[in-house]
């Protein structure tokens, strides 16, 4: 799978994580920090 950094317009897309662009799947993906979940890493869990 080809991945790259997200475009600059997606700055802030991932609330608590790193945004990566999955080129072949035509979508952005959030790699969440420890303790966070959700499509955009918006949920905190203990």
């Amino acid at each position: 799978v080809s991945i790259t950094k997200c475009n600059s317009d997606m700055n802030g897309y991932c609330l608590h994580g790193q945004c990566i662009y999955l080129v072949d799947m035509s979508q952005n993906y959030c790699r969440c920090e420890v303790g966070y979940t959700g499509v955009r890493c918006e949920h905190f869990y203990l």
């Epitope: 790259t4 475009n7 600059s8 317009d9 997606m10 802030g12 897309y13 609330l15 662009y21 080129v23 035509s26 979508q27 952005n28 499509v39 955009r40 918006e42």
Partner: antibody, heavy 116, light 106 residues
Framework: QDQLVQSGAEVKKPGASVKVSCKAS????????IQWVRQAPGQGLEWMGR????????KYREKFEGRVTITADTSTNTAYMELSSLRSEDTAVYYC?????????WGQGTLVTVSS | DIQMTQSPSSLSASVGDRVTITCKAS??????IAWYQQKPGQAPRLLIQ???TLQPGVPSRFSGSGSGTDYTFTISSLQPEDIATYYC????????FGGGTKVEIK
């Protein structure tokens, strides 16, 4: 199956406002950005602006600043584009477009006609 | 706002010809360019994103290339069903469409 269903065609008088809706099904708009694009008859595509429904953050093309308002109601999974002070040059098909989780998934378009 | 200058605005070519459309950005867009095909009365159809990634179901005669500010879209062998208007879109920093290229059969 993911869908963006837009409101029906509108006819407005110059100076009036129009509000076009874009209802999402099959996905949560909070996971995406919703863009708005328009196309006047026989003309090219023109990006108007976008909203991040989760953060309620908006960005607009400079030429539309002060005249366009993009909002989202996450409880109904619907985005809206309101354009005020309409003039004949605003006659166009208006499209909502999902981006973020999937590259550019388009609604069917809404024709807005501005005529006296 | 980033400006996208697309050329030519129209072209006429024969079936089987190689067709090339270019888009020049006013600043580096880091390969974040997409190409759309639009036929009369229809919504635009995404052909290519991230400069060269073909969408599922799009024929391999369509291709894209480029980097920095200069990008190219190519139809290697024009077919009658390719008659349409083609648009580039930069999506690095917000969004800007090129002016479009109307492709006709000679």
């Amino acid at each position: 199956q993911d869908q963006l269903v837009q409101s029906g065609a509108e006819v407005k008088k110059p100076g009036a406002s129009v509000k076009v809706s874009c209802k999402a099904s099959g996905f949560n708009i909070k996971d995406t950005y919703i863009q708005w694009v328009r196309q006047a008859p026989g003309q090219g595509l023109e990006w108007m602006g976008r909203i991040d429904p989760l953060r309620r953050n908006t960005k607009y093309r400079e030429k539309f600043e002060g005249r366009v308002t993009i909002t989202a109601d996450t409880s109904t999974n619907t985005a809206y584009m309101e354009l005020s002070s309409l003039r004949s040059e605003d006659t166009a098909v208006y499209y909502c477009v999902r981006s973020g989780t999937l590259f550019d998934f388009w609604g069917q378009g809404t024709l807005v006609t501005v005529s006296s | 706002d980033i400006q996208m200058t697309q050329s030519p605005s129209s072209l006429s070519a024969s079936v089987g010809d190689r067709v090339t459309i270019t888009c020049k950005a006013s600043q580096d867009i880091h390969k974040y360019i997409a190409w759309y095909q639009q036929k009369p009365g229809q919504a635009p159809r995404l052909l290519i994103q991230y400069t060269s990634t073909l969408q599922p179901g799009v024929p391999s005669r369509f291709s894209g290339s480029g980097s920095g500010t200069d990008y190219t879209f190519t139809i290697s062998s024009l077919q009658p069903e390719d008659i349409a208007t083609y648009y580039c879109l930069q999506y690095d920093n917000l969004r800007t469409f090129g002016g479009g290229t109307k492709v006709e059969i000679k």
